[in-house]
């Protein structure tokens, strides 16, 4: 007989609980964890369960994006009586279990954070043996990854009527403010931020018409730092050369 429970309520501390007489499942996760790109972060997750002294096979799972159906980023399994949870899946080798599932701790460490790791994560524990039961955090923990600006692309492109335009794309969190400077632009020109669809950390600024030869510099800045890159426009018989 396989029996399972699922959370039905959650308070503001993200303590997810299912309780009935003589049994109680709960999962405790913080609403958010923040860390800088390149660093490591710990996603805490602890739980309680109604199966006293459970010693059978156990699986710990973390998934990203959405509960129950999101892709797994980490999975480990512990054999009956074992405190060692053998890693079966660690996406890109950057996820490892810090907690001991036998002691009701599923806390996960994520190494070498990237902006793409900025997602919601959900912990899940499964028992299989004499007892069959499973429980998953429905609300999860948001991993907020911050990053100093980085210019990922700067280029000069042809425009209609033998004109040229410059594009600068930068990433960072908070999303950086972009500014252009260059010949006949004065010291700087603020550009309207336009985060790309599906790329919340990418910002692009365009100089629609480059009227003079010379160096054009794009500066990206947020609360964590600044970055700049340049392109050079030289027109020879209607051709352009650009370098960064």
């Amino acid at each position: 007989f396989v029996r399972t429970k699922i959370d039905t309520t959650e308070n503001l501390l993200n303590t997810e609980v299912h309780s009935s007489p003589a049994q109680r499942w709960s999962m405790q996760v913080p609403p958010e964890v923040s860390a800088e790109a390149g660093d490591a972060a710990v996603l805490p997750c602890t739980f309680t369960h109604p199966h006293r002294h459970y010693d059978g096979p156990l699986t710990a799972i973390w998934r990203a994006g959405e509960p129950y159906a999101g892709p797994q980023v980490f999975r480990c399994a512990a054999a009956r009586g074992s405190e060692l949870c053998q890693t079966a899946l660690s996406l890109h080798g950057r996820f490892r279990l810090l907690g001991n599932p036998r002691r009701n701790d599923l806390s996960l460490r994520v190494e070498r954070l990237a902006l793409a790791d900025d997602r919601r994560y959900f912990c899940r524990v499964e028992f299989a043996g004499d007892v069959h039961d499973r429980y998953e955090s429905r609300h999860g923990v948001r991993l907020h990854v911050t990053a100093a600006p980085r210019i990922v692309n700067i280029s000069v492109l042809p425009s209609p009527a033998h004109a040229f335009r410059a594009l600068c794309t930068a990433e960072g969190e908070p999303p950086p403010a972009l500014a252009w400077s260059g010949p006949a632009l004065g010291n700087s020109l603020a550009a309207v931020r336009s985060p790309r669809e599906g790329h919340g950390h990418l910002v692009t600024a365009e100089l629609p018409a480059l009227t003079h030869d010379g160096r054009y510099t794009c500066t990206a800045a947020n609360s964590l730092g600044r970055s700049e890159a340049s392109v050079y426009l030289f027109r020879f018989h209607g051709a352009s050369g650009a370098s960064t």
Partner: antibody
Amino acid sequence: EVQLLESGGGLVQPGGSLRLSCAASGFTFSSYAMSWVRQAPGKGLEWVSTITGGGESTYYADSVKGRFTISRDNSKNTLYLQMNSLRAEDTAVYYCAKAIGSSWYSDAFDLWGQGTMVTVSS
Amino acid sequence: DIQMTQSPSSVSASVGDRVTITCRASQDISSWLAWYQQKPGKAPKLLIYVASSLQSGVPSRFSGSGSGTDFTLTISSLQPEDFATYYCQQSYSIPYTFGQGTKLEIK
């Protein structure tokens, strides 16, 4: 493309045997529990069997216990159902289905094959 | 075994109608309930899992609710392609069991 493709169905006499296969593609096969679900002509859906992602555990409906065996070959991304001592009431379309959730549990079946017809008749 | 009972067994409705199908479990299954749509000659398609989570790619006019023993599938505004048979299924305990189905027909 994420898909499941069943094969092996056909006409068999009562007491006979048949082996169904389900070829999976487009997802990490070993990470998910897999199941067989059947549907008799004009009837509803009936769960038949489930196997965990690594093949550690298998589960069966009482109606097939001792006669059917579910197995999987993760190196070939293939699920099997060995059906022995077939009866007329086993006549149905057999679907293989992927679990949503995990390698141990089927929280729901989010991917289904097209089905393969098994007819048990003399 | 847990018995799943759907009602009604069939329902006639028109395009644009709001339709509700109910599913009752013979014991508490928490939120471990899924809803499927099946068209003649086709495999079932997952609509809702864990009682209320909408499967990716399924139109938002489908919604699920309930926990414990009583569950509901609602189609807010019927479209021509929604005429099919709908099944509920519990994944709380093995053997997994399905409701007998609800056939949604054009009025």
